[in-house]
Every structure is written in structure tokens, then in C-alpha cells.
């Protein structure tokens, strides 16, 4: 496969990654689809420095990230280990709240208006952030 050496148009480069910030909203699964079709993934926050960078760009707006527990345990979409990794939940979150009346609990994580994280109903149409790493070989199958 080929390597990406610079960010696409309208993406922002930071610390050897490229970020794209939406200005509309989608349900978490639809945002996930969108990032994948950009050969990217929903943003995976691995440090306080990256948290501050993303927070600066999204402002005080609910925004999906690549973290969910739809299949049980919390998982990052790129396979980054959740248990040992960076976390920035709001106090008493995640709470898998069932009181919203929309059916089920809360299985998808988002940045809240102060940047800290909350779990929410995955169908809510929030903004989202895509991320892709520079110098990472694409996952195209090898040519035979």
C-alpha cells in the first residue's frame, strides 16, 4: 500500500496526524462510516495534549469521538487499549443512563461543551472528528 505523507485539503495536521472537523451532525454510526470512507477513523484521544488540541478546534459543542461500548467493554475504534489509555470523563460518567426515554442506555462517547467526556445515546446527531495518521501504510490489499 501507499503511505500518506501530507494531510488532505481541509484537514488539519498536528503531531503527525491529520484531523477533520465536521460542521454538521450525524449519529455515531454514520459519523464512523464517514470517517472510514475518508480512510480515517473517529478521533482517538491518547493524551492530554491531543485532548486540548481537539477541544480548541471543536469549541463548546457536543462532538463524537471514536470510543464506544456497544458490544460490552469500552473500546477505541483503532484498537488503542482503553483501560490503560488516556481518559477525560466528566464526574460520574460514563453512567449508561436509561432515563432519556429513547430506549437502551448510552453507548457512545462525546466531547461535551467543556471538553470533558460523556456517554450518550448513539443516535443523537452530534458533530464529529475524523483522524488519520501520517506515514501509516494504507490497508489496501497487496497487488498480486
Amino acid at each position: 500500500g501507499s503511505e500518506r505523507t501530507c494531510c488532505p485539503v481541509n484537514w488539519v495536521e498536528h503531531e503527525r496526524s491529520c484531523y477533520w472537523f465536521s460542521r454538521s451532525g450525524k449519529a455515531w454510526a454514520d459519523a464512523d462510516n464517514y470517517c472510514r470512507l475518508e480512510d480515517a477513523h473517529l478521533v482517538v484521544v491518547t493524551s492530554w495534549e491531543e485532548q486540548k488540541f481537539v477541544q480548541h478546534h471543536i469549541g463548546p459543542v457536543n462532538t463524537w469521538m471514536g470510543l464506544h461500548d456497544q458490544n460490552g467493554p469500552w473500546k477505541w475504534v483503532d484498537g488503542t487499549d482503553y483501560e490503560t489509555g488516556f481518559k477525560n470523563w466528566r464526574p460520574e460518567q460514563p453512567d449508561d443512563w436509561y432515563g432519556h426515554g429513547l430506549g437502551g442506555g448510552e453507548d457512545c462517547a462525546h466531547f461535551t461543551d467543556d471538553g470533558r467526556w460523556n456517554d450518550d445515546v448513539c443516535q443523537r446527531p452530534y458533530r464529529w472528528v475524523c483522524e488519520t495518521e501520517l506515514d501509516k501504510a494504507s490497508q489496501e490489499p497487496p497487488l498480486l
Partner: antibody
Framework: QVQLVESGGGVVQPGRSLRLSCAAS????????MHWVRQAPGKGLEWVAV????????YHADSVKGRFTISRDNSKNTLYLQMNSLRAEDTAVYYC??????????????WGQGTTVTVSS | DIQMTQSPSSLSASVGDRVTITCQAS??????LNWYQQKPGKAPKLLIY???NLETGVPSRFSGSGSGTDFTFAISSLQPEDIATYYC?????????FGQGTRLEIK
């Protein structure tokens, strides 16, 4: 100029396979996602599949899922649609379409002229 | 899936008339809407993207408006060469879906 040229259509029996190709020119093919869209005779337009610019991510309409596969070869500037287990209802003109760079959606801008697939015994 | 309801399904108008077509989405699609023109035996041609932006090279008599769920396409002064079928298309959410089309005829 930007051009998409489909080929590979024809008459095929139900249950058989066919592979459509789309040759792209006049733009950097490897920088664009691509779609297939079809139109049955006298009917409206139906989206079939989309693939990312690098080829590693793709989505298919439920009506073709498990039977059709979209793929691409960026070294040949070519998009493909492998169609297996063809049915009469797959009879249509198949269009290759470039995904536009409109951020946040899956827009389409440039269309090929289409290739006709007829599934008949 | 998002349903796109386009109306009318057919329309007959005179040269010089103003013509309007509407498209309603079953859920909010922001401005992720295209309008296409298709003539018999030809591929669809993009006229309007992002609900209201005129594609390069398209005559200014064509226009689009709307956001959210309700959209309108207009031809300010119908010309003989505008005889075609017109389609709206949402591209916010997969699967991408189209309106059923509006066949435009000259009186």
C-alpha cells in the same frame, strides 16, 4: 478533461457473474472516493456502492450486499464492480460516479456514460 | 433509510415560465442535497450541489434552496433544452437515496 468510461456490460443469465470496469482520466483518481449507481429501464436512480479513495473501506446497498463487490486499482486508474449471483432485477444501466469533495457528505459530481447489464435467460 | 419525496412527478409548462420542483427528506439532511438533470439515453448531469450551489458551467436560470428537510429547485425561465427528468438526491447518510424524479415537458 475529467472522464469516466464504463465497460463490461452485456447480456448474462440469472445466477451468473459479470465484472464492470470504469476507466478514469483527467483527474487524480487516487484522491477521490468513487460510487456505482444504477438505473433500471424506465425507472429512477439507485445507489449501489461506494469505496474510499485508498480502497480499504467500502459500503454496499442492502439490495446487492453479499452479491456485488466494489473495488479499485489506483495504479490503473480503474474502478470495478464484481457482480455475482445476478438476478433479473439487476438489469439496469450502471454508472460509475466520482465522489465529490464536498465535506461531510457523500456527494457525486462527475458521471460516466453508463454500461448496460441485462440479466435474462 | 432516508426517504426523498419529490413533487410533482410530472410537470408541463410553457417556454419562459418559472418552474419549481420540491423535495422533502424524511429526516434532517442539512444541506447535503444535489439536483440532477437527465435527458433520455444520457447520464444524469449535476446542476446544483449542497442544496443551493450552482455547478460550474450550469446556466444561472437554475437555482436551488432549502436546508434541513425541505428543498426547492427552480428554473426561472424555461427553455426548450430544459426538457428532461430532474432528480433530487440526499448524500448525508448511507445509503444515498434519490427522489423518484420529475418529468418536465413543454406545453
Amino acid at each position: 478533461q475529467v472522464q469516466l468510461v464504463e465497460s463490461g456490460g452485456g447480456v448474462v443469465q440469472p445466477g451468473r457473474s459479470l465484472r464492470l470496469s470504469c476507466a478514469a482520466s483527467g483527474f487524480t483518481f487516487s484522491s477521490y472516493g468513487m460510487h456505482w449507481v444504477r438505473q433500471a429501464p424506465g425507472k429512477g436512480l439507485e445507489w449501489v456502492a461506494v469505496i474510499s479513495y485508498g480502497g480499504s473501506n467500502k459500503y454496499h446497498a442492502d439490495s446487492v450486499k453479499g452479491r456485488f463487490t466494489i473495488s479499485r486499482d489506483n495504479s490503473k486508474n480503474t474502478l470495478y464492480l464484481q457482480m455475482n449471483s445476478l438476478r433479473a432485477e439487476d438489469t439496469a444501466v450502471y454508472y460509475c460516479v466520482r465522489r465529490s469533495s464536498s465535506s461531510g457528505g457523500y456527494g457525486m459530481d462527475v458521471w460516466g456514460q453508463g454500461t448496460t447489464v441485462t440479466v435474462s435467460s | 433509510d432516508i426517504q426523498m419525496t419529490q413533487s410533482p412527478s410530472s410537470l408541463s409548462a410553457s417556454v419562459g415560465d418559472r418552474v419549481t420542483i420540491t423535495c422533502q427528506a424524511s429526516q434532517d439532511i442539512y444541506n447535503y442535497l444535489n439536483w440532477y438533470q437527465q435527458k433520455p439515453g444520457k447520464a444524469p448531469k449535476l446542476l446544483i450541489y449542497d442544496a443551493s450551489n450552482l455547478e460550474t458551467g450550469v446556466p444561472s436560470r437554475f437555482s436551488g434552496s432549502g436546508s434541513g428537510t425541505d428543498f426547492t429547485f427552480a428554473i426561472s425561465s424555461l427553455q426548450p433544452e430544459d426538457i428532461a427528468t430532474y432528480y433530487c438526491q440526499q448524500y448525508d447518510i448511507l445509503p444515498i437515496t434519490f427522489g423518484q424524479g420529475t418529468r418536465l415537458e413543454i406545453k
